[in-house]
Structure formats: C-alpha cells, structure tokens
Amino acid sequence: GITIPRNPGCPNSEDKNFPRTVMVNLNIHNRNTNTNPKRSSDYYNRSTSPWNLHRNEDPERYPSVIWEAQCRHLGCINADGNVDYHMNSVPIQQEILVLRREPPHCPNSFRLEKILVSVGCTCVTPIVHHVQ
Amino acid sequence: GITIPRNPGCPNSEDKNFPRTVMVNLNIHNRNTNTNPKRSSDYYNRSTSPWNLHRNEDPERYPSVIWEAQCRHLGCINADGNVDYHMNSVPIQQEILVLRREPPHCPNSFRLEKILVSVGCTCVTPIVHHVQ
C-alpha cells in the first residue's frame, strides 16, 4: 500500500501512545463547501434495491438525528417492476464517528463514539451454498 | 436567569478559547461491539452496480484512512454479466465527521471537519428528460 511519511513528532492514531484526551475545536469546517454533490435524495426510490429511511434519534448524541436505511425487499426490482428473489437487496453500512457527552451532563467534555449505520441498499448476486 | 450548577467533575473551561475548544476522549467506544454485522466487504464485487474502493489517507486526519467508493461503470450489470446503459450506477454519499489536526502536526489539538464520502454504489432507473 501507499506509505505516507509520518511526522516523527506526531503520534500515530493507531498507536497505543496516541493521546487519549485531546482539545477539539467544535467550529466545524466543511470540506465540501465548493462542491455541489448530486443529492442522493431520490435514489432510495429509484434504486433496484429501494430503501426506506428511519429516524434514529438520541438527544445526548451529536448528530442527534441519524437517518438509517432499511431495504424494502429481500429481492431486487426487475425491469418489469417486480421483485426478483434471485437477487438480494442488501444494506451498505459504514462506521461513523459521533460525539457523546462524557461524563453525562458535562457541557465541555465529550467522547468519540463509533456507530455502524446503513446508508442505503445495493442489489447483489446471492451467494449460493451447494449441498454436498 | 436560570443558574445551572456546574459539575465539579467536569473539565475546566476557563480557557481564552472556550467555548470553541473542548476536551474529547479519543478512547473510542464502539456501539457495535456486540453485533456481528454481515460484512459488506464483498458487496462491491457482487453488486449489479459494482464499485472500486480507493484508499484516501491523510495522517493529519482522524481517522487517517477512509475508503472511498467509485462506481466501476456508468450502467449496471445485467443478468448476462454485461453493462446495461439503460440503468445507472450511482454513488451513495454520506457526510461524516472527522478530526483534523489544527494547527497542522500538533498531536493534541484538532478541529471537527465534515466531509462527504461515497460509501458504495446502487443501481437506479435514470431520470429521462423529454425534449419538448
């Protein structure tokens, strides 16, 4: 793989010596300000593996609302608009970072938390297990 | 006005940069430790809208490695294994939070950053614009 030269003065984030508690500026910088990404807003309906979006809410977490995808069908939508069970709709999942107050109710102390979210669905060929 | 009792166990915020800068514990708690989600690791090959995964590495960011999806085709793979251009492979994107060292190379000082990542691809029916 590609090796990025590390600053010898900086700890590696995968390293056991990586700092446990750090200072973080909460004034979020948006890396995508100049881009105008095509909104995937209607893909959930137009996909051959369509999904519904469910609201996962937790006021003690940031972001407080996360929209989770749930595939509508076990199979995929074919050219005739019917569900084809020879194919499978599966969720595409991603681990994301969220913030949680820790200790609880402390206004300026947080903990990073990693959660797995389903972002959307894709249509895949099933894995067929042949009986010996 | 309402007076909020300060929790003596909370970190002090008498810093001149308060309250833009807060303490964050990076000893990440994984909410999904007890779950064993089906790895979506092979979906990128089995999908009718397959994608390649590109390693986006940045030692000044946490996490330093993010895998970005790029759809392999404009169209989708049909039952014969050929690309069908009557359908479109499109990336499913999500905004995620990351930490960036700020100032650069400082081990214990970060800024929250929001970036748009492509997590995978899905196959959608195209939007057809009819010429009047």
């Epitope: 609201r55 809410e57 006021p59 972001p63 407080s64 996360i66 | 309250p19 833009r20």
Partner: antibody
Framework: QVQLQQSGPGLVKPSQTLSLTCAIS??????????WGWIRQSPSRGLEWLGR?????????DYAVSVKSRITINPDTSKNQFSLQLNSVTPEDTAVYYC??????????????WGQGTLVTVSS | EIVLTQSPATLSLSPGERATLSCRAS???????LAWYQQKPGQAPRLLIY???NRATGIPARFSGSGSGTDFTLTISSLEPEDFAVYYC??????????FGQGTKVEIK
C-alpha cells in the same frame, strides 16, 4: 432564491379551525435536506414552534406538545406548498403565524427562510 | 422542555458600541443546534448565526456567536444604526424540543 408566501384568513371565530397555507418557490416541499414548519408569535408567548413536516422516503410529522391534539400540517406536492390547520381555537391562539424552512442537514438545524407572517385574530 | 433565558431584556447602547447578548439554557444543548435571529418591527425573524458560531449568508462580520453547553453569547462588535432590533436565540434538542428565548431588545440610548 427560495421564498415562502403565506395565505389565509386573518380572523377566525372561537372553536373553529384556523387554516393557513405556505407556497414554496425555489425549493421543493419534498426536499430531503429541509423540513417545513410553522411558528407563531404573540406578546404573551413570544416565538413558539408549532410543528414541521419533512420527507425522507415517507412523510414525517412532528408537533409541539402544547398543540399536538389540535394541529395538522399537510404537504401538497402538486402545488409545492404546505398547510397548517389548528382546531378548536381560542383567543389565546391569536398571534402572528409564520411558515419557515428548517435546514435539516443532520449536523445543523435552523430556520433560514421565513414567510411574511399572517396576523390571525381569534374573536367572535 | 428546555427553557432559554435571554439577558438582559433590554440593552440601551449608542451606535459604535459593543453589544453582548446572553442566552442561557436550562440544560445542555448541542452548540451545533443553537441559532440566533434578528427581528425588526413588522418583519419576520432573520437568521444571523447557526451552529452557535457560524454566520449565515450575507450577515456582516460584526456579528459573532460563541458558547457551548448551557451558555451562549451573541456579540455585535460595533453597533450600526440598522442593528437596533430584537434578538432571539433558538435551540433544537430533539425533533419535539425546539424552543426560542424571550428576546433581547437592543435600543438606542
């Protein structure tokens, strides 16, 4: 640019239904990055959020506890507008009613576009 | 329900002076979901600041916001004649908890 245009009667009798409409231009009522809400303002209550609708593969309705039993917010996708209905009104419902777009990006939430406001008086 | 208490109720200042407006929440709110609005007589509120410290499009640099937890501040570094108005803070804690402060009136001394 995005604009919201309110319409509806300025006088409603007690026990009747208050009905207002908000027409959207420059955005869509079924946008996935916005919610569409109603807020009212009176000298006694100040600014009071009443409720919102948002579309994320289906319509979501969220209503303030104070009016939950009396309020309905509906979208009209064909006309790209949304409406407020408040049943069984009393003189305490007299206020300036605003429709507003709530930016709902997961990472932020705020009202960036407001209608011009409609003064609704509840009186016989 | 989270109560937002703004202080002072009225601020009497002269053009060119610095205005500091306070908004205190009855419990912790995420700074990312805290906004400030300006309202002039007969007009709808206008967004000034979102995410506690981000200026909305077209808002002059003399307006700045800060704060986290329960204490938030709106600062106008040097008052212009058009800045005399009522200012409101607003928080979003959950889909059913969205409240405004009672407002601070900035008037000409």
């Amino acid at each position: 640019q995005v604009q919201l245009q309110q319409s509806g009667p300025g006088l409603v009798k007690p026990s009747q239904t208050l009905s207002l409409t908000c027409a959207i231009s420059g955005d869509s009522v079924s946008s996935s990055s916005a919610a569409w809400g109603w807020i009212r303002q009176s000298p006694s209550r100040g600014l009071e959020w009443l409720g919102r609708i948002s579309y994320r593969s289906k319509w979501y309705n969220d209503y303030a506890v104070s009016v939950k039993s009396r309020i309905t917010i509906n979208p009209d996708t064909s006309k790209n507008q949304f409406s407020l209905q408040l049943n069984s009104v009393t003189p305490e419902d007299t206020a300036v009613y605003y429709c507003a777009r709530e930016v709902d990006s997961m990472y932020y939430s705020y009202f960036d576009i407001w209608g011009q406001g409609t003064l609704v008086t509840v009186s016989s | 329900e989270i109560v937002l208490t703004q202080s002072p109720a009225t601020l009497s200042l002269s053009p060119g002076e610095r205005a500091t407006l306070s908004c205190r929440a009855s419990q912790n709110v995420w700074a990312f979901y805290l906004a400030w609005y300006q309202q002039k007589p007969g007009q709808a509120p206008r967004l000034l600041i979102y995410g506690a410290s981000n200026r909305a499009t077209g808002i002059p640099a003399r307006f700045s916001g800060s704060g986290s937890g329960t204490d938030f501040t709106l600062t106008i570094s040097s008052l212009e004649p058009e800045d005399f108005a009522v200012y409101y803070c607003q928080q979003y804690r959950s889909t059913l908890s969205l409240t405004f402060g009672q407002g601070t009136k900035v008037e000409i001394k």
